[in-house]
């Protein structure tokens, strides 16, 4: 597969930021701000939490989520999974692209039950036009949103 | 905003590395090595800890800091904040771009009070010519410098 | 050093994924899948765990490893080192490029002995044709492979 980047074309890129509406509690992917503040779309589009590819190629995709809590809730698995997943018209289920598992609540200390952790993912994947990439966090209740700088999702063609 | 990357132009990029002088203790940003070893500047400049943009565009900016300590010092907050911040002539205060909070000292174990942790940040932001990006770590006393491979700061145009 | 990226040339990129054969136990670098699933090579080659540069330039190189264990090693340093290293014909020893140290097993909690952690590294380095980049993890016994999405290694020219 040969991919050329012609000098007169804009290089697709996007950076989406966390917002109060990001966490739906519905079991769906995280939702993102696309326009305000640091967020932008250039040569990519957005739909229901997904970055939608308009031009096929290799993309560096990335996401960071800010995690935080108080102690280790017994009702929660101590494992948090943060992943980037692909949705393609050619396959009925989401495909895992880049995934991390973390056990952040063990970070609570003897002097403080509050803990913070951050998960970063990034890597190059091939995406066809029309394919979508989403971010999921299980358990999303531990994602801490604030101002778009701590949890985000982006991509650019390489 | 349309940004073209012409084939005869060099693509701005930089990678700055941690050095003994990085931690000033003055409340300012971290300082960086720009020439020795792995460090370089190409189409970007440097001033007092800041990467200075000479060509406007979208940049993937990144930083990693190596954290370490012995136990959880009571005099320190158990939360460490690592962030990339923008300084612009159009606004008097620094703007948060990408930020992480971590509670690393909970990683000390029963058999060892020594702990290590690493914080990585990366994302795409739009930067105008003359704007500056800096790295801050609070509390910077927990940043562990060695040889430029463990704490660093870089960017490249996308 | 001036580097041009001509529009008719393909931009070198690669993403290699973790596989059952990645962990050799021999003290060598991790080995990687280069073709199946999400893995690919484009303008870079591969040999014995190494990405081999065919075209000199500045590359953003990255790696993530998924770590996991049960409790903490007794009497051992609980530190894990994850790094990207360069092999060059001009120098007999590997050179550290990007390195992280983590103490993940302190993440085990009172209710769960199992812990998970992830280490991500990424940064821009200059590589000459024929130079090689490898990933090492010490102690590699704590790397948890599954399906190529949790531990990986890649690069692209910037």
């Amino acid at each position: 597969l040969i991919q050329e980047r012609r000098s007169h074309e804009v290089n697709p890129a996007a950076h989406l930021t966390g917002a109060n509406s990001s966490l739906t509690g519905s079991g769906g992917p995280l939702l993102w701000e696309t326009q305000l503040g640091l967020a932008f779309l250039r040569g990519l589009s957005y739909h229901d939490g997904a970055l939608v590819v308009t031009k096929a190629g290799y993309y560096y995709i990335y996401s960071k989520v800010q995690l935080g809590g108080v102690g280790c809730p017994l009702g929660l698995a101590s494992t948090i999974t943060h992943g980037l997943y692909k949705r393609t018209p050619r396959y009925p289920e989401e495909l895992e692209l880049l995934v991390s598992q973390q056990s952040p609540c063990g970070r609570a200390t003897s002097s403080s039950r509050v803990w913070w952790d951050s998960s970063f993912l990034g890597g190059v994947v091939h995406l066809e036009a029309g394919e979508k990439v989403v971010v999921r966090v299980l358990d999303e209740r531990l994602v801490r949103l604030r101002d778009g700088t701590r949890s985000y999702f982006g991509a650019f063609m390489v | 905003l349309i940004q073209e990357r012409r084939s005869h132009e060099v693509n701005p990029a930089a990678h700055l590395t941690g050095a003994n002088s990085s931690l000033t203790g003055s409340g300012g940003p971290l300082l960086w090595e720009t020439q020795l070893g792995l460090a370089f500047l190409r189409g970007l400049s440097y001033h007092d800890g800041a990467l200075v943009v000479t060509k406007a565009g979208y940049y993937y900016i990144y930083s990693k800091v190596q954290l370490g300590g012995v136990g959880c010092p009571l005099g320190l907050a158990s939360t460490i904040t690592h962030g990339l911040y923008k300084r612009t002539p159009r606004y008097p205060e620094e703007l948060e771009l990408l930020v992480s909070q971590q509670s690393p000292c909970g990683r000390a174990t029963s058999s060892s009070r020594v702990w290590w942790d690493s914080s990585f940040l990366g994302g795409v932001v739009h930067l105008e010519a003359g704007e500056k990006v800096v790295v801050r770590v609070l509390d910077e006393r927990l940043v562990r410098l060695r040889d430029g491979t463990r704490s660093y700061f870089g960017a490249f145009m996308v | 050093l001036i580097q041009e990226r001509r529009s008719h040339e393909v931009n070198p990129a690669a993403h290699l994924t973790g596989a059952n054969s990645s962990l050799t136990g021999s003290g060598g670098p991790l080995l990687w899948e280069t073709q199946l699933g999400l893995a690919f090579l484009r303008g870079l080659s591969y040999h014995d765990g190494a990405l081999v540069v065919t075209k000199a330039g500045y590359y953003y190189i990255y790696s993530k490893v998924q770590l996991g264990g049960v409790g903490c090693p007794l009497g051992l340093a609980s530190t894990i080192t994850h790094g990207l290293y360069k092999r060059t014909p001009r120098y007999p020893e590997e050179l550290e490029l990007l390195v992280s140290q983590q103490s993940p097993c302190g993440r085990a909690t009172s209710s769960s002995r199992v812990w998970w952690d992830s280490s991500f590294l990424g940064g821009v380095v200059h590589l000459e044709a024929g130079e090689k980049v490898v990933v090492r993890v010490l102690d590699e016994r704590l790397v948890r492979l599954r399906d190529g999405t949790r531990s990986y290694f890649g690069a692209f020219m910037v």
Epitope: A77, T79 | S110, S111 | G68, G69, V70, G71, C72, P73, L74, G75, L76, C105, S111, S112, R113, V114, D139, R141, L142, R144
Partner: antibody, heavy 119, light 107 residues
Framework: QIQLLQSGPELEKPGETVKISCKAS????????MNWVKQAPGKGLKWMGW????????TYADDFKGRFAFSLETSASTAYLQINNLKNEDTATYFC????????????WGQGTSVTVSS | DIVLTQSPKFMSTSVGDRVSITCKAS??????VAWYQQKPGHSPKLLLY???TRHTGVPDRFTGSGSGTDFTLTISNVQSEDLADYFC?????????FGAGTKLELK
């Protein structure tokens, strides 16, 4: 190669005390915890607890608190299980098993020591 | 305590068959499950850990799957030397617990 060698079978009367040994070889003894597991005749496996071979700190499962004691002779790479005030229901085979922190569970087991309690 | 419910208790098979043993945990144990084989008069032998990773020297006819609460050990192409008791074991939370066992015997 890694081996756990346990002491031989024991025939004891109720009320007596027995001490079983488990000698490790082929690895650094103090880097891995040691579990003790009971298997009554014709029954399944029951975890009794473990001892931190680095610190010497024992942890006992609820059913094995009181009459049971784990100890070490680190210089000899040996772990011990002592059962005091033996009862008929202590009749079983007792296994030591290495606790592997990289997630293998109990990866190496001793051959077992049969303890018979009979008056 | 986490209870591991293993089924069936007994399984009759023939050489060459494919058999599956299930283990259900009363709480989420992540993938911290091991499977052991025990022959009469011998100590248990580790087959699989992390639910699906084969221990050194274990034939590839032994496979494991599952995470959370439901786990399966499958033996494809059963050999006569596979006739034994099989136990699942969770090592993710204290107290560590075992399933009651499954006896694999010839028809």
């Amino acid at each position: 190669q890694i081996q756990l060698l346990q002491s031989g079978p024991e025939l004891e009367k109720p009320g007596e005390t027995v001490k079983i040994s488990c000698k490790a070889s082929g690895y650094t003894f103090t880097n891995y915890g040691m579990n003790w597991v009971k298997q009554a005749p014709g029954k399944g496996l029951k975890w009794m607890g473990w001892i931190n071979t680095y610190t010497g700190e024992p942890t006992y499962a609820d059913d094995f608190k009181g009459r049971f004691a784990f100890s070490l002779e680190t210089s000899a790479s040996t772990a011990y299980l002592q059962i005091n005030n033996l009862k008929n229901e202590d009749t079983a085979t007792y296994f030591c098993a290495r606790d592997n922190w990289d997630g293998k569970g109990m990866d190496y087991w001793g051959q077992g020591t049969s303890v018979t309690v009979s008056s | 305590d986490i209870v591991l419910t293993q089924s069936p208790k007994f399984m009759s098979t023939s050489v060459g068959d494919r058999v599956s043993i299930t283990c259900k945990a009363s709480q989420d144990v992540d993938t911290a499950v091991a499977w052991y084989q025990q022959k009469p008069g011998h100590s248990p032998k580790l087959l699989l850990y992390w639910a699906s990773t084969r221990h050194t020297g274990v034939p590839d006819r032994f496979t494991g799957s599952g995470s959370g609460t439901d786990f399966t050990l499958t033996i494809s192409n059963v050999q006569s030397e596979d006739l034994a008791d099989y136990f699942c074991h969770q090592y993710g939370s204290y107290p560590l617990t075992f399933g009651a066992g499954t006896k694999l015997e010839l028809k």
